[in-house]
């Protein structure tokens, strides 16, 4: 059910492209294609290519993305395109100018001098942004989200975008300076992962991150469980980055117990993050237990 045909506007197309990209990434990383048949991988890649080609129709002259060509470009959507395309680089041919042009736009047009990334044209499909929705720590959460995307594009775009390392440092400085007084577990988790990627989740910041976990196994706020799955997935990625393998098993167990297999309305971020995190876990964790995750591969009829 994760392999779907992407379609629609610049936002809907990314909603459709997400589960296919992450499912292929997950099965590649965990070497599980034999279970489904390698021929299905080719079918899934065709769908990713289709999604990529369709997304280019929503690329603006500035290299940013929006739901429609005539709509003001969105910081969040552009960062999300960067994130998904960065992951898809190993799967299909992606023009680095498309990817790095978007990175350049984020840095030159949307980053303020204090490192914060601002959103001037929020997405229409608010359900696709996950825990960033109605977040009262928006500067921190959005900056962390964009920073993670930039770091995932770093190896691809460093040579083309000279300002990338400085932009990453500035955004990291902002997160670091404001981390200790965060209230929401979601923001602690997403900003924690962004800082961990930079090697900056240390000392008191690490204590803040670890002690925010409920029962040492989940990063949870009141409200939508989908957001808690997303937040805990970011936290798991941070723990793996930190090589904190003592803390990891209960977190993986909790994520597994949610029996969350992705798909469905409003699940874009939770789906992407849980499969990214669990793929990373199976790759990184020594002697990990096998995870029985239900990834069904029914290719859509043409």
């Amino acid at each position: 059910h994760l392999i779907v045909t992407p379609s629609g506007c610049g936002e809907q197309n990314m909603i459709g492209m997400t589960p296919t990209v992450i499912a292929v990434h997950y099965l590649d990383e965990t070497e599980q294609w034999e279970k489904f048949g390698l021929e299905k991988r080719q079918g899934a890649l065709e769908l990713i290519k289709k999604g990529y080609t369709q997304q280019l129709a929503f690329r603006q002259p500035s290299s940013a993305f929006a739901a429609f060509v005539k709509r003001a470009p969105s910081t969040w959507l552009t960062a999300y395109v960067v994130k998904v395309f960065s992951l898809a680089v190993n799967l299909i041919a992606i023009d680095s100018q498309v990817l790095c042009g978007a990175v350049k736009w984020l840095i030159l047009e949307k980053q303020k001098p204090d490192g914060v990334f601002q959103e001037d044209a929020p997405v229409i499909h608010q359900e696709m942004i996950g825990g960033l929705r109605n977040n009262n720590e928006k500067d921190m959460a959005l900056t962390a989200f964009v920073l993670i995307s930039l770091q995932e594009a770093k190896d691809i775009c460093e040579e083309q975008v000279n300002s990338l390392p400085g932009s990453i440092t500035k955004a990291g400085d902002f997160l670091e300076a404001n981390y200790m007084n965060l209230q929401r577990s979601y923001t602690v988790a997403i900003a924690g992962y962004a800082l961990a990627q930079m090697g900056r989740l240390k000392g008191p910041l690490l204590n803040k991150f670890l002690t925010t976990a409920k029962d040492k196994n989940r990063w949870e706020d009141p409200g939508k469980q989908l957001y808690n799955v997303e937040a805990t997935s970011y936290a798991l990625l941070a723990l793996l980055q930190l090589k904190d393998f003592d803390f990891v098993p209960p977190v993986v167990r909790w994520l597994n117990e949610q029996r969350y297999y992705g798909g469905g309305y409003g699940s874009t971020q939770a789906t992407f993050m849980v499969f990214q995190a669990l793929a990373q876990y199976q790759k990184d964790a020594p002697d990990h237990q096998e995870l029985n995750l239900d990834v069904s591969l029914q290719l859509p009829s043409r």
Partner: antibody, heavy 119, light 113 residues
Framework: QVQLQQSGAELVRPGTSVKVSCKAS????????IEWIKQRPGQGLEWIGV????????NYNEKFKGKATLTADKSSNTAYMHLSSLTSEDSAVYFC????????????WGQGTSVTVSS | DIVMTQSPSSLAMSVGQKVTMSCKSS????????????LAWYQQKPGQCPKVLVY???TRESGVPDRFIGSGSGTDFTLTISSVQAEDLADYFC?????????FGSGTKLEIK
């Protein structure tokens, strides 16, 4: 302004337990970590552990696991440290402290609570 | 755990003199990703709680007189009082907050002649 007010001095018997309190005011209690530090007479400082009052999550120095238990009551903006199975080694001044700036150094401290373990 | 070693354990100085105290860590406190040393210096006057003087090895806490100067990087750190005053009579502790558990030096006691 930020203040941490600790409970008064305690004289307790060996083998018993004690609970030290730290009442916070002047800031959003649930947003900031509370650290606990031990200082024995004429000696240095030892980090016991930390509590996140918002989640109740804790992290301890291995040395104090089983000795100290940290809790927090959001309704009264108070953090607590429970010390069990007391011996003369536990006689010390105990401080609570918090980070309010982004220096990562503990910039606000309670006045300290003296615990004396004696028969 | 990171071990913090302070020296000297005590020193007596006259008002106006320059004071230097040392703190060494058993491993580097420099985070290469932000070029910051995770070290603080505290002053504890008799019967009081500790007070931050310097953080990130060399940044003076606001309100702290500029005669207090923190320096050093990696494993070797120094706190200098450029011209000691009578009110500086206190114990001085260094603390690393690079890794958990946080650890303190055993302190330097400053006495005024």
């Amino acid at each position: 302004q930020v203040q941490l007010q600790q409970s008064g001095a305690e004289l307790v018997r060996p083998g018993t337990s004690v609970k030290v309190s730290c009442k916070a005011s002047g800031y959003a209690f649930t947003n900031y970590l509370i650290e606990w530090i031990k200082q024995r007479p004429g000696q240095g400082l030892e980090w016991i552990g930390v509590i996140n009052p918002g989640s109740g999550g804790t992290n301890y120095n291995e040395k104090f696991k089983g000795k100290a238990t940290l809790t927090a009551d959001k309704s009264s903006n108070t953090a607590y440290m429970h010390l069990s199975s007391l011996t003369s080694e536990d006689s010390a001044v105990y401080f609570c402290a918090t980070y309010y700036s982004n220096s990562f150094a503990m910039d606000y401290w309670g006045q300290g609570t003296s615990v004396t373990v004696s028969s | 755990d990171i071990v913090m070693t302070q020296s000297p354990s005590s020193l007596a100085m006259s008002v106006g003199q320059k004071v230097t105290m040392s703190c060494k860590s058993s491993q580097s406190l420099l985070n290469s990703s932000n070029q910051k040393n995770y070290l603080a210096w505290y002053q504890q006057k008799p019967g009081q709680c500790p007070k931050v003087l310097v953080y990130f090895a060399s940044t003076r806490e606001s309100g702290v007189p500029d005669r207090f100067i923190g320096s050093g990087s990696g494993t070797d750190f120094t706190l200098t009082i450029s011209s000691v005053q009578a009110e500086d009579l206190a114990d001085y502790f260094c603390q690393q907050y690079y890794s958990i558990p946080f650890t303190f030096g055993s302190g330097t006691k400053l006495e005024i002649k």
